[in-house]
């Protein structure tokens, strides 16, 4: 049965868009006018995984790409990256665990948990331009909630 | 409480068409996926197939040339048929509910038809 | 398509722990599911998501699944918990059971 997706971008709290850095890295930083068309552009895949009432599994794939955001660990440190997939498979309802976010939504706000490494989040710095990452700390200096928005397909 | 209940001919030749019913009682239809299973006497579970209610299907490849699995969401049952039958398809066969809050597993099962395949 | 391996029985005396084991090439990156099954009935599931128990499994239950095996730990087996348990993963979007383990308790 074929997966369900929808294309969003993200934002994080700080209103800071996500953009490509290199061919394998997201960086997060805010973006004006024009320059909103860098911002990259998620299908965001339904997929297996724990399911309640605010929680909701999900695979970040790049639009048009067969990239996807996938947690591994990297020097034993659970680690965001891009990872390359064959599109003829992907995206597919039984997502692996690398890929696997769980959106956990409260007051309107979004995290995105990483299914592989519990409590670890996709997190983005206070500091302009730098790397999106996998952070294990909620609540402190690093931001771990976004926003999202629909894009017509 | 989610019920799910079975029925079809438990005795066939050789040749003949396996086709079986589940009913499905309690609970929302069109928000889940359902399942079907085998297990031959003495021996492990083996996955047919799936479906969920707009009649999309995902069938395991050693068995799709000759299972064909189907919805009717006005009764809340969906039904497996599987053709040219010989005696390695006599199974205990049910029919469960794959979930979306248990991971898209199997949680709720029917009571199994036991299906002999004999001449 | 993968396959996913069970010793066929495991035994264990009243109130100790039982482990169960399946193993299957990178089992630990896909979800693992444990089924029940006791003679004449249908499966129940007991473990899913790797370690997540169902309501009205008993808390005795637990799972764990990295690298290439997933584990179905009982602790304070009782004589009830006799049974065949099965794994369950997906490989291709086609779900793949164990063979099945025979727990005996002694």
């Known amino acids: 049965a074929p997966v369900r997706s929808l294309n969003c971008t993200l934002r994080d709290s700080q209103q800071k868009s996500l953009v490509m850095s290199g061919p394998y890295e997201l960086k997060a930083l805010h973006l004006q006018g024009q320059d909103m068309e860098q911002q990259v552009v998620f299908s965001m895949s339904f997929v297996q995984g724990e399911e309640s009432n605010d929680k909701i599994p999900v695979a970040l794939g790049l639009k048009e790409k067969n990239l996807y955001l996938s947690c591994v660990l990297k020097d034993d440190k659970p680690t965001l990256q891009l990872e390359s997939v064959d599109p003829k498979n992907y995206p597919k309802k039984k997502m692996e665990k690398r890929f696997v976010f769980n959106k956990i939504e409260i007051n309107n706000k979004l995290e995105f948990e990483s299914a592989q490494f519990p409590n670890w989040y996709i997190s983005t710095s206070q500091a302009e331009n730098m790397p999106v990452f996998l952070g294990g700390t909620k609540g402190g200096q690093d931001i771990t909630d976004f926003t999202m928005q629909f894009v017509s397909s | 409480q989610v019920q799910l209940q079975q029925w079809g001919a438990g005795l066939l030749k050789p040749s003949e068409t396996l086709s079986l019913t589940c009913a499905v009682y309690?609970?929302?239809?069109?928000?889940?996926?359902w399942s079907w299973i085998r297990q031959p006497p003495g021996k492990g579970l083996e996955w047919i197939g799936e479906i969920d209610h707009s009649g999309s299907t995902n069938y395991n490849p050693s068995l799709k040339s000759r299972v064909t699995i189907s919805v009717d969401t006005s009764k809340n049952q969906f039904s497996l048929k599987l053709s040219s039958v010989t005696a390695a398809d006599t199974a205990v066969y049910y029919c469960?509910?794959?979930?979306?809050?248990?991971?898209?597993?199997?949680?709720?099962w029917g009571q199994g038809t036991l299906v002999t395949v004999s001449s | 398509q993968s396959v996913l391996t069970q010793p066929p029985s495991v035994s264990v005396s009243p109130g100790q722990t039982a482990s169960i084991t399946c193993s299957g090439d990178?089992?630990?990156?896909?979800?693992a599911f444990w089924y029940q099954q006791k003679p004449g009935q249908s499966p129940v599931l007991v473990i899913y998501?790797?370690?997540k128990r169902p309501s009205g499994i008993p808390e005795r239950f637990s799972g764990s699944n990295s690298g290439n095996t997933a584990t179905l730990t009982i602790s304070g087996t009782q004589a009830l918990d006799e049974a065949d348990y099965y794994c369950q993963a997906w490989d291709s979007n086609i779900e793949v059971f164990g063979g099945g383990t025979k727990l005996t308790v002694l």
């Open positions: 990178k089992l630990g990156d896909k979800f």
């Open positions: 998501l790797d370690n």
């Open positions: 469960a509910r794959a979930s979306p809050s248990s991971g898209w597993t199997l949680d709720y």
């Open positions: 309690g609970g929302s239809f069109s928000d889940y996926y």
